[in-house]
Interface confidence: low
């Protein structure tokens, strides 16, 4: 089971929707539903994201960058990694900056893994600058 | 197949050279030249690197960190993955930031993988600093 | 052989002290010792790490974060991974940055694997935001 | 030495599109910043829009944001800037200029391309 | 946005007048202003960046100063080649110029 989903610019909600079939993305053994990875064999994952933030005018508002995970059994939302970036550039002027995540999970079927960002507007969404993906290990 | 190239401070030009012997550096099924590692075996890597960027005096000019891909059976290169830092520090200062990509890439027999930076004075090619790897899947 | 360790508010000292038990922590096939990572399988491991730092009031003091290694039957450690931050938020302000570090090492039955930081009251040890994990190839 | 060359300005009229191209030479093309700056007859500067040296990240004024669009070809050592929905006021000079750091100043200019919009 | 305010709008001198000219902004802009000299029918060339900092091949005539909101670019001994608009430029936020200042034979 693997899967590399690219940013997808017609992300227009949290969480974030993704790229399935073209250019580098690819996807087998887990079904893509909704912005979500979804699991159909148990075991354990390298699940990893990127995210490429940009923006024209420096506020340094507070960047989150997070790889969720939920299975419609249970109630709420477990927050498997997340990244948070406050006070990361200077006043005003036009920045760029990129949080990458990733790690090993244990999942189990029906396990839906999304990525949640502070900001859609500051996303540039070119497949080789956000990205979100896992494999079985 | 598996590689771990670290840094070469003997880096002339872009894409980067790499250390493939000593150290931590490790290499098998795969081939490395010429600053890029060559395919042997089609099927899904996953790729990384890290490159430590740093200066004596900040102008935040920007860095770019790119991991791409050319088979020159085909015409121009892949970007499989890139981070862009823009306004990341504060002028006139010393400075030192990383750039981590990593990702899952269906690679094909002769595919070449190279690293490319926006400026190799800005580089420290110390082992543990600056790297790239795969392995397959 | 898998391990994912994710922070422990009760890191007193360096190296880290993790949590091997509870949450989205796991551990197989290798053993967690005050700190370290055992390895009990000689082979090629893919090893990962993330740290959260955050402060109340920069001062761009030097953040340091190293996966490192100790085999006791030879003197030192070796550095992995590490990065290093300068000069990377606004003085005087909240702030909040993460490191990330990732790649392949041909490890050793007895190998102890360590996560070393700068400064321990910088980090945050929520377990999706600073962890320590490893896997076989 | 570096040389920057407008061409493509000329009188259009309302509402109509135009070209305009920078070419490059005397420098590492790709590996710097350009800018679009404009001086309506008369007046003073003002910033139209920059490109990052390799073309992925791109933003705008406000004047114009949403009708022109600025893209580069390193292959060629050239800037373009499409102007699209032309107005009266997008009538003046303007000119290509180098980014010296980070899209701050302007080091090089060119010596302008005269655009006029008038019915 | 950020408005700059040059001041005066027009300026009469003579050859070997120390010359000063004003630059405001509506908000602070740290040093972050960069002076540019423009002749007509010409570019403008770059003269001084982050406030102070002479451009290489600029005459040592010039120099720029201040910070936060008031700037001042001043030429200690004017030339006949000087004679000219001069414009500042914040790029702290965006890139904004002032309206200009032309400076003319008195």
């Known amino acids: 089971s693997v899967a590399h989903l690219t940013g997808n610019p017609r992300s227009r909600s949290i969480p974030l929707e993704w790229e399935d079939t073209y250019g580098t993305a690819l996807i087998s053994g887990v079904k893509y539903k909704k912005g979500g990875l979804v699991i159909n064999e148990a075991g354990l994952y390298f699940v990893y994201s990127k995210v490429y933030f940009r923006g024209q005018s420096c506020n340094s508002q507070p960047l989150s960058h997070k790889v969720y995970m939920r299975n419609f059994k249970y109630p709420g939302d477990l927050v498997l990694m997340e990244e948070k970036k406050l006070n990361y550039c200077t006043t005003g002027q036009i920045w760029a900056h990129s949080s990458y995540l990733g790690a090993v999970f244990n999942l189990t079927v029906a396990d839906h893994l999304y990525v949640n960002i502070s900001q859609l507007s500051l996303i540039n969404f070119e497949e080789s600058k956000t990205f979100f993906g896992l494999y079985k290990l | 197949s598996v590689a771990h190239l670290t840094g070469n401070p003997r880096s002339r030009s872009i894409p980067l050279e790499w250390e493939d012997t000593y150290g931590t550096a490790l290499i098998s099924g795969v081939k490395y030249k010429k600053g890029g590692l060559v395919i042997n075996e089609a099927g899904l890597y996953f790729v990384y690197s890290k490159v430590y960027f740093r200066g004596q005096s900040c102008n935040s000019q920007p860095l770019s960190h790119k991991v791409y891909m050319r088979n020159f059976k085909y015409p121009g290169d892949l970007v499989l993955m890139e981070e862009k830092k823009l306004n990341y520090c504060t002028t006139g200062q010393i400075w030192a930031h990383s750039s981590y990509l990593g990702a899952v890439f269906n690679l094909t027999v002769a595919d070449h993988l190279y690293v490319n930076i926006s400026q190799l004075s800005l580089i420290n090619f110390e082992e543990s600093k600056t790297f790239f790897g795969l392995y397959k899947l | 052989s898998v391990a994912h360790l994710t922070g422990n508010p009760r890191s007193r000292s360096i190296p880290l002290e993790w949590e091997d038990t509870y949450g989205t922590a796991l551990i197989s096939g290798v053993k967690y010792k005050k700190g370290g990572l055992v390895i009990n399988e000689a082979g090629l491991y893919f090893v990962y790490s993330k740290v959260y730092f955050r402060g109340q009031s920069c001062n761009s003091q030097p953040l340091s974060h190293k996966v490192y290694m100790r085999n006791f039957k030879y003197p030192g450690d070796l550095v992995l991974m590490e990065e290093k931050k300068l000069n990377y938020c606004t003085t005087g302000q909240i702030w909040a940055h993460s490191s990330y570090l990732g790649a392949v090492f041909n490890l050793t039955v007895a190998d102890h694997l360590y996560v070393n930081i700068s400064q321990l009251s910088l980090i945050n040890f929520e377990e999706s935001k600073t962890f320590f994990g490893l896997y076989k190839l | 030495q570096v040389q920057l060359v407008e061409s493509g300005g000329g009188v259009v009229q309302p509402g109509r599109s135009l070209r305009l191209s920078c070419a490059a030479s005397?420098?590492?093309?790709?590996?710097?910043?350009i800018h679009w700056v404009r001086q309506a007859p008369g007046k003073g500067l003002e910033w139209v829009a920059v490109?990052?040296?390799?073309?992925?990240?791109?933003f705008y004024a406000d004047s114009v944001k949403g009708r022109f669009t600025i893209s580069r070809d390193n292959s060629k050592n050239t800037l373009y800037l499409q102007m699209n929905s032309l107005r009266a006021e997008d009538t003046a000079v303007y000119y290509c200029a180098r980014d010296r750091d980070n899209w701050n100043y302007f080091d090089y200019w060119g010596q302008g391309t005269l655009v006029t919009v008038s019915s | 946005d950020i408005q700059m305010t040059q001041s005066p709008s027009t300026l009469s001198a003579s050859v070997g007048d120390r010359v000063t000219i004003t630059c405001r902004a509506s908000?602070?802009?740290?040093?972050?202003l960069a002076w540019y000299q423009q002749k007509p029918g010409k570019a403008p060339k770059f003269l001084i960046y982050?406030?102070?900092s002479l451009e290489s091949g600029v005459p040592s005539r010039f120099s720029g100063s201040g910070s936060g909101t008031e700037f001042t670019l001043t030429i200690s001994s004017l030339q006949p080649d000087d004679f000219a608009t001069y414009y500042c430029q914040q790029y702290n936020s965006y890139i904004t110029f002032g309206q200009g200042t032309r400076l003319e034979i008195k």
């Open positions: 982050q406030a102070s």
């Open positions: 490109i990052w040296y390799d073309g992925s990240d791109k």
């Open positions: 908000q602070s802009i740290s040093s972050w």
């Open positions: 005397g420098f590492t093309f790709s590996t710097y910043g």
